[in-house]
Amino acid sequence: EAHKSEIAHRYNDLGEQHFKGLVLIAFSQYLQKCSYDEHAKLVQEVTDFAKTCVADESAANCDKSLHTLFGDKLCAIPNLRENYGELADCCTKQEPERNECFLQHKDDNPSLPPFERPEAEAMCTSFKENPTTFMGHYLHEVARRHPYFYAPELLYYAEQYNEILTQCCAEADKESCLTPKLDGVKEKALVSSVRQRMKCSSMQKFGERAFKAWAVARLSQTFPNADFAEITKLATDLTKVNKECCHGDLLECADDRAELAKYMCENQATISSKLQTCCDKPLLKKAHCLSEVEHDTMPADLPAIAADFVEDQEVCKNYAEAKDVFLGTFLYEYSRRHPDYSVSLLLRLAKKYEATLEKCCAEANPPACYGTVLAEFQPLVEEPKNLVKTNCDLYEKLGEYGFQNAILVRYTQKAPQVSTPTLVEAARNLGRVGTKCCTLPEDQRLPCVEDYLSAILNRVCLLHEKTPVSEHVTKCCSGSLVERRPCFSALTVDETYVPKEFKAETFTFHSDICTLPEKEKQIKKQTALAELVKHKPKATAEQLKTVMDDFAQFLDTCCKAADKDTCFSTEGPNLVTRCKDALA
């Protein structure tokens, strides 16, 4: 229904706290360099204005669209051109072009320092002094580093953060209470960020149809007892919610997500028997819980899908009459029977089925042509299954750090032109798949591994798009989203690459490395490893292991030495010489 004042409508629906949080996220995601105080001031102004509209919907400007209101606020910021360069040109445009322009200027890799967590005492002091400001800082810092973070989900993580601080700041040993809990939230939030970015990429590059197909597969796996009409309704609503969030319409997105959660909880009987626990929770927790609810028990008996999709004499007629609906039912029927497959795999199977029908339904004897289609799925299914087995075996053998190194070598060989920091970040993230997925039960491994890898590779593609350097990466990133992971997996050593010259300074280390946290030490070593591969792309695993073991021994020795500086300056050059010899 139409409302006289959109801003009053959203303020009323969301309540002041969520309204303010979402406006802060929106501004932080659009203008990523502004300070918290600058954004907080704008948020307060917008909130005060929303209140006047709630009091009187026909007050001046209350009938304006949210894009107009927010865009006008952003464009009124002083020194916009000085701070943001060509983004200021967006302000010369009218809506909806202005908002599109802002979206295009979102930076997936902003040059901001890493978000450092203050030490426990300081954190608790500022939290106790002003919890609202403290949480505002959290929303601002996360949102500007992750400009596509799913806004209502970020409110959920802020709520988690709040609960952890409330609990731990009352403890004697604040540090040991906070650290593991906040690490857990950070890890989950980072995964949530790359997953959501993948959804927005799907929407931006391939449109709503592609996202809706993803949603149909995912929802059918989770709710195998829901009928196709129910799955379609949920997929349509979920697509709308994600379209809004990806498009920067965060108030509408959060409001519609709450509506969807309400609908699901009111219709549990036709959706799933597993929703009640989620539905008993307050709003943010409820929506989060529903988004990762366990799969419902499969129906006691389901037939094979061949009867409807291969053996039926009307296959081509049914397909021609309503292509998307027919393919949608195929995806639904296949997905509800296979919670053990990744969504990416299910979409590849549906794509193969579609291509087969396109080809066969134009032939003289269609049934003879498409009759073997289900058997032709075999290589598509076996490829990711083998990937999971190979990689999980390797992870179990090497552990997370060793597994990351193996992936780093592999990917540096595939795309040696990519910058070392990007390769290290990608390998570290890809390597976490072992810890995340390989310990799961057999039937959960494939969906976990492949859908996580796809999300990480999407980030690789986004970073590469900014500065394209590798034809291999461009090739894999240009294709469809579901083909990316198999494309990257199939890449081999880039034969066109001219090895980097050996520069001693790249492998020269100083005693300051000894005091770095373990994570930073690992990154330094992995940076050196990537550089080694760029110098010798065809080095064997044995050669690289020899060099890295030598390097680890050198660090261990010098960091234990009484005179660390002397050790580094005398032993360092020896290490460099040994490295060159080992790789010769």
Partner: nanobody
């Protein structure tokens, strides 16, 4: 440890009948679709028939429709294959297999396999 043990194979004349059995252990039988596959000498393994978890649905290969019947007894953790009107081209090693998730009845969906039982149709 999951085990599937086939029995009932043997030599039979064309037009004759055989009943194969497959006893399963080490898995929750009623949670698995079951299937029979066969491999003739020098040929690829092929799908024969499969049956849904509850036994309400079956899916036959065209070559055996009307001659073979699959059934299961979940209380006995056993699946059966009644083979009538046997032909020389039915000669093969018959494998029993179990699939936790079942959509197409194709080989790649089956997680566990038996060692096979030999059926020879010859006059």
């Amino acid at each position: 440890e999951v085990q599937l043990v086939e029995s009932g194979g043997g030599v039979v004349q064309p037009g004759g009948s055989l009943r194969l059995s497959c006893a399963a252990s080490g898995l929750t039988f009623s949670s698995y679709a079951m299937g029979w596959f066969r491999q003739a000498p020098g040929k690829e393994r092929e799908r024969v028939v499969s049956i849904s978890r509850g036994g309400g649905y079956t899916y036959y290969a065209d070559s055996v429709k009307g001659r073979f019947t699959i059934s299961r007894d979940n209380s006995k953790n056993t699946v059966y294959l009644q083979m009538n009107s046997l032909r020389p081209e039915d000669t093969a090693l018959y494998y029993c297999a179990a699939a936790r998730y079942w959509a197409t009845g194709s080989e790649y969906e089956f997680d566990y396999w038996g060692q096979g039982t030999l059926v020879t149709v010859s006059s």
